[in-house]
Interface confidence: medium
């Protein structure tokens, strides 16, 4: 839980955070697990502590190893571990596996690739852009902030995609790349109106008090790929977040296809425990996009 | 040096209502989340509920929701727990304690308490 | 809820003995999890945080194992004063829970 994996290259800067979260004003500590040396916080070394980040600028292979970060309130201490691996630049234009972070997939309708970790830099605008290791140029690429949109994606547009920024730091820049997968859904889709399958509206569901129950809200949006389709649970007219009880729980949206091509999103409410008290409230399935909201109701009654 | 003072226990009927406060000195009140935790005679501890330190978020037992309202006043340094519609098995030892960590909801350990109020519902 | 199950309920030793306490989770909480001591007419004191950090002004003799679901407190040489209840807690999620306490009485 407290241990995090990063990576980078070398030659380039690589900016680590503690993985033990504190408040902002506790100090951080950071040492070299294998040597327990501690990392300087001077910022005239090429590799120092800045509160809860470690800063390699730039990184070099022997920079590799284990780092533990400890975070140090008034009256506790909480430690933390950063692997870091710094790997050689690659001689050709292959990037591998294990310099790539996670895939994301786009269409026609949605095709944003952010540039991962890019938060942790101190960096300007625009962000140069690479698939294959060949600049993006062209109307069809716009760089805006920490992102990519391509207009008219086409499935020849799948491919890694590197971004490349400048951090800066006390006047002194250090290039930075990252890489990441890109995928294309193919398919000419179309946007409607939301149609939520499921719970029907003004729908009781039997519960017994005591056991464990799940509401799922189940909406379609159109075919293909959507932009901005969400489902949601609110309680009383509440979000879920903003609803502090532990024992409800609404879990992330799981797109589904139907042979049909519908594209559709599911999104369970978990109760746990089910309390005298949640026969209340009142289970709003919200289903929204670009067309508007629609909402279904359903109540919990006793068995 | 970090006090916690409880006061506001006594004995009060089944249906009855209480409200507790706790003093606090010798730390900044408003940046730490509160707890309240109550311990049954002869029995181990139980959590109440708890509030973050600016107010907004509270978080209640299953025991003690929609009867319990936790809240603090920051300009007082003082935290306080109304208690309505109390029942027999309300009855113990009321602690409040702090959390020296606590962010966004992930609570912590509890490293101050005071040294607590006792509250009895019986008729 | 998580639920915390400590063994034995009750512990009998002699001062000088080293006291072992086992403290089990329903499911995983990493090393979200703390000890306390309690004595009678007393309020609760920190002893462990992190599953095997000592807290602030708590003797060396007080140590803390384990992570996941099985944890341990050990004391390797027990003082008077160290007879009392000891309760875990646990901290990964809402709501915070107890285990039911071992009493550690002399022999």
């Known amino acids: 839980k407290f241990s995090k994996q990063s990576w980078g290259l070398e030659n380039e800067a690589l900016i680590v955070r503690c993985p033990r979260q504190g408040k902002s004003s506790y100090i951080v500590d950071w040492y070299y697990s294998q040597t327990n040396k501690s990392i300087p916080t001077q910022e005239r070394n090429r590799v120092f502590a800045s509160g809860q980040l470690l800063k390699f600028l730039p990184a070099e292979v022997a920079d590799s190893g284990i780092y533990t970060c400890i975070v140090r309130s008034p009256t506790f201490n909480r430690t933390g571990y950063a692997n870091v691996t710094i790997y050689k630049k690659q001689p050709d234009c292959n990037v591998p596996d294990y310099l790539m972070y996670s895939t994301v997939s786009g269409s026609e309708k949605n095709s944003k690739i952010y540039c991962p970790t890019i938060d942790l830099y101190n960096w300007t605008a625009p962000l140069e852009w690479f698939k294959n290791c060949q600049a993006l140029q062209g109307s069809r690429y716009k760089a805006h902030k920490s992102f990519l949109v391509i207009d008219n994606v086409m499935t020849d547009d799948a491919g890694d995609y590197t971004c490349k920024f400048i951090h800066n730091e006390n006047g002194a820049n250090y290039s930075v790349t990252a890489t990441r997968s890109f995928t294309v859904k193919d398919e000419q889709g179309f946007s409607l109106f939301p149609v939520i399958r499921a719970p029907a509206h003004n729908e009781t569901k039997e519960v017994e008090i005591g056991e464990n129950t799940n509401l799922t809200c189940s909406a379609c949006f159109g075919k293909g790929a959507q932009f901005l389709a969400t489902v949601q649970w609110q309680l009383n007219g509440n979000k879920i977040t903003d609803f502090s009880e532990p024992r409800i729980q609404q879990e992330e949206g799981q797109n589904q296809s139907f042979s049909n091509g519908l594209a559709c999103v599911n999104t369970v409410l978990r109760i746990a425990d089910v309390k005298e008290e949640d026969l209340l409230l009142r289970y709003d399935c919200l289903a929204l996009n670009l067309h508007g909201l629609r909402r279904h109701t359903i109540r919990l009654s006793r068995k | 040096e970090v006090q916690l003072l409880e006061s506001g226990g006594g004995l009060v009927q089944p249906g009855g209502s209480l409200r507790l406060s706790c003093a606090a000195s010798?730390?900044?009140?408003?940046?730490?989340?509160m707890f309240w935790v109550r311990q049954a005679p002869g029995k181990g501890l139980e959590w109440v509920s708890a509030?973050?330190?600016?107010?907004?978020?509270?978080y209640y037992a299953d025991s003690v929701k929609g009867r319990f309202t936790i809240s603090r006043d920051n300009s007082k340094n003082t935290l306080y727990l109304q208690m309505n519609s109390l029942r027999a098995e309300d009855t113990a030892v009321y602690y409040c304690?702090?959390?020296?960590?606590?962010?966004?909801?992930?609570?912590?350990?509890?490293?101050?308490w005071g040294q607590g109020t006792l509250v009895t519902v019986s008729s | 809820e998580i639920v915390l199950t400590q063994s034995p309920a009750t512990l009998s030793l002699s001062p000088g003995e080293r006291a072992t306490l086992s403290c089990r989770a329903s499911?995983?909480?990493?090393?979200?999890l703390a000890w306390y001591q309690q004595k009678p007419g007393q309020a609760p004191r920190l002893l462990i945080y992190?599953?095997?950090n000592r807290a602030t002004g708590i003797p060396a003799r007080f140590s803390g194992s384990g992570s996941g679901t099985d944890f341990t407190l050990t004391i390797s040489s027990l003082e008077p004063e160290d007879f009392a209840v000891y309760y875990c807690?646990?901290?990964?999620?809402?709501?915070?829970?107890f285990g039911q306490g071992t009493k550690v009485e002399i022999k």
């Open positions: 010798g730390f900044t009140f408003s940046s730490y989340d």
């Open positions: 499911q995983s909480v990493d090393d979200d």
């Open positions: 992190d599953a095997s």
């Open positions: 509030i973050a330190g600016e107010g907004g978020r509270t």
């Open positions: 807690q646990q901290y990964i999620g809402a709501p915070i829970t």
């Open positions: 304690a702090r959390d020296p960590w606590s962010t966004e909801g992930s609570f912590f350990v509890l490293d101050y």
